[in-house]
Interface confidence: medium
């Protein structure tokens, strides 16, 4: 068998809401994956499990089952959404994310995703980890790859 390539493309969108009383942030983060089947037979993407970490704490998990079948030498782009909650001991972030005097409220999140594929009864897992910027201050749609965390973002001069 040839490889099945999983490429984490980045955050597609992040939709934010707040609970003022609980000082809690709810972020629905939609991510994009490219899965390439380099084989001459079809492969089933059985499930995708994802989790999001902020400051080494898991703030959201998601699992998608029976997702799709990828034909021979084909590639499919798959979007998946992870609902996250920033609360309790991290409620100090509420103040940062709702501070109106700055426009961009970027936080760095670690995106972890595991894709399970099956073919001829054989199962294979491929995992990826990537740090991404997400704006916790407003609803944002990103150009693919735009949210990638490479180094500390330099402010506009």
């Amino acid at each position: 068998p040839r490889s099945i390539d999983v490429k984490y493309i980045g955050v597609k969108s992040a939709y934010v809401s707040y609970d003022v009383q609980k000082r809690t942030i709810y972020l629905n983060i939609t991510n994009t994956l490219n899965i390439t089947n380099n084989n001459y037979y079809s492969v089933e993407v059985e499930n995708i499990t994802a989790q999001v970490q902020f400051s080494k704490t898991v703030i959201g998990k998601a699992r998608l089952n029976n997702i799709t079948i990828i034909g021979p030498l084909d590639m499919k782009q798959i979007d998946y959404t992870v609902p996250t909650v920033i609360a309790e001991e991290m409620s100090y972030m509420y103040d940062f994310c709702t501070l109106i005097s700055i426009k961009v409220h970027n936080i760095v999140l670690m995106m972890q995703v595991t894709v399970t594929t099956t073919y001829f009864g054989h199962s294979e897992q491929i995992s990826q980890e990537r740090y991404q910027y997400v704006d916790c201050g407003r609803n944002t749609t990103y150009q693919l790859g735009q949210s990638e965390y490479l180094n500390v973002l330099q402010p506009q001069q």
């Epitope: 103040d95 501070l99 005097s101 700055i102 426009k103 961009v104 970027n106 506009q156």
Partner: antibody, heavy 123, light 112 residues
């Protein structure tokens, strides 16, 4: 040298609308929020709203939300405020002012102001 | 909306003396990041407002150090020492912690 240029005066009829301009020079237009502030004769200052020229993100004072529309023309570094449904109550001086945007906290915010446009609503 | 109150419509002062102008907010303007989101402006007769103080106590560029700002989360004071004739005008406080930004009604500085 930073400058915010506004026309001196506008005379308009009740029920019509007016579009006020504020031309910025001396700094990068898209790095600064543009605010609009109203001052009726002999009265205090009232914040109308602001706009981020980089992406036209706006915030309005609810009091003006239905009648004020803030826009920008990046090519000419000009901010506009259109005020519709004018009445005599809208006779006032309208100022534009800028403050740092983007990743910065508003340090010395609203540190430059235009000279103001005096709007008179009269038939 | 946050209400900004300047109780004194005017304050008379003799040139060379000191004067304090007060302002109160209906909600604390102190953010957990340590910044207090309060400005002080002067509007001289026939002119546009001019920034004096930002974040409660920071002197804006070009403002003489005769001006100083202080206060807590809800009670603020602008102090002018050695008042000069050019200090005449209306002084406004303004909050920018929350939208909509709101101004105090203004305090007029008058020379005795």
């Amino acid at each position: 040298q930073v400058q915010l240029q506004q026309p001196g005066a506008e005379l308009v009829k009740p029920g019509t609308s007016v579009k006020l301009s504020c031309k910025a020079s001396g700094s990068t237009f898209t790095n600064y929020w543009m605010h609009w502030v109203m001052q009726r004769p002999g009265q205090g200052l009232e914040w109308i709203g602001n706009i981020d020229p980089s992406d036209s993100d706006t915030h309005y004072n609810q009091k003006f939300k239905d009648r004020a529309k803030l826009t920008v023309d990046k090519s000419s570094s000009t901010a506009y405020m259109q005020l519709s449904g004018l009445t005599s109550e809208d006779s006032a001086v309208y100022y534009c002012a800028r403050s740092r945007g983007g990743y910065y906290d508003y340090g010395e915010a609203m540190d430059y102001w235009g000279q103001g446009t005096s709007v008179t609503v009269s038939s | 909306d946050i209400v900004m109150t300047q109780a004194a419509p005017s304050v008379p002062v003799t040139p060379g003396e000191s004067v304090s102008i007060s302002c109160r907010s209906s909600k604390s303007l102190l953010h957990t990041n340590g910044n207090t989101y309060l400005f002080w402006f002067i509007q001289r007769p026939g002119q546009s407002p001019h920034l004096l103080i930002y974040r409660k106590s920071n002197l804006a560029s070009g403002v003489p150090d005769r001006f100083s700002g202080s206060g807590s989360g809800t009670a603020f004071t602008l102090r002018i020492s050695r008042v000069e004739a050019e200090d005449v005008g209306v002084y406004y406080c303004m909050q920018h912690l929350e939208y909509p930004f709101t101004f105090g009604s203004g305090t007029k500085l008058e020379i005795k």
